[in-house]
Interface confidence: low
């Protein structure tokens, strides 16, 4: 069946060294456990995180994200996920694309991450 992928609609802000959570969901909401869910950087499409066949595909991840990401799947049964990035760096700032793929159907949405200096206040 067809669906749309929806991001938060506003930039996600995080402090350097902190964690960031980038949410993404499908509409209408449905169980996405069997889908492929992925996140990559725009515009160069470095793989940030990939979930396929019920498993995180760590081997396909770009080296700069290895060990720093987690797909939050508590609500994947409702079609909602979030990408958690740990130990956020200035270089993490920018555009991310999340996608859901269900057999022969794929859609994407965009999320922007803004990284701020905790010592600037």
């Amino acid at each position: 069946g067809q669906f749309r992928v929806i991001g938060p609609g506003h930039p996600i802000r995080a402090l350097v060294g902190d964690e960031a959570e980038l949410p993404c969901r499908i509409s209408p909401g449905k169980n996405a456990t069997g889908m492929e869910v992925g996140w990559y950087r725009s515009p160069f499409s470095r793989v940030v995180h990939l979930y396929r066949n019920g498993k995180d595909q760590d081997a396909e991840q770009a080296p700069e994200y290895r060990g720093r990401t987690e797909l939050l799947k508590e609500s994947i049964g409702e079609g909602k996920v979030a990408l958690r990035i740990q130990n956020v760096r200035f270089s993490d700032e920018g555009g991310y694309t999340c996608f859901f793929r269900d057999h022969s159907y794929q859609e994407e949405a965009a999320v922007e991450l803004k990284v701020e200096d905790p010592f600037y206040w």
């Epitope: 990559y40 725009s42 515009p43 160069f44 499409s45 470095r46 793989v47 396909e60 555009g95 694309t97 996608f99 994407e108 949405a109 965009a110």
Partner: nanobody, 117 residues
Framework: QVQLVESGGGLVQTGGSLRLSCAAS??????MGWFRQAPGNQRELVAI???????NYADSVKGRFTISGDNVKNTVTLQMNSLNPEDTAVYYC?????????????WGQGTQVTVSS
């Protein structure tokens, strides 16, 4: 605004091959791909490629179709081999990416592929 120029459709016999190309002007893509729509059916994914080189295929075309892209020239090509009548459809190119700080999707006009038995 992104302009998509598709080429390469046509009529071919069962077992034959065709090559579809799509060129995008105006912005670098995040994904470019090919979708198709047969009469009375929903538009469905055929093959899609990220600018990083990751490709995904519909199960029905795996092993027969190959997508390739050039994210410098902003082009994507679909090589279709071992075509059969079930592949008959209008094939649409789709561009997804950042255009003037906005994440946007654009569709081509479509190109007809007809496979005769």
């Amino acid at each position: 605004q992104v302009q998509l120029v598709e080429s390469g459709g046509g009529l071919v016999q069962t077992g034959g091959s065709l090559r579809l190309s799509c060129a995008a002007s105006g912005s670098m893509f995040s994904t470019m791909g090919w979708f198709r729509q047969a009469p009375g059916n929903q538009r469905e994914l055929v093959a899609i490629m990220s600018s990083g080189g990751t490709a995904n295929y519909a199960d029905s075309v795996k092993g027969r179709f190959t997508i390739s892209g050039d994210n410098v020239k902003n082009t994507v090509t679909l090589q279709m081999n071992s075509l059969n009548p079930e592949d008959t459809a209008v094939y649409y190119c789709r561009f997804t990416g950042w255009v003037k700080s906005s994440f946007s999707t654009y569709w081509g006009q479509g190109t007809q592929v007809t496979v005769s038995s």
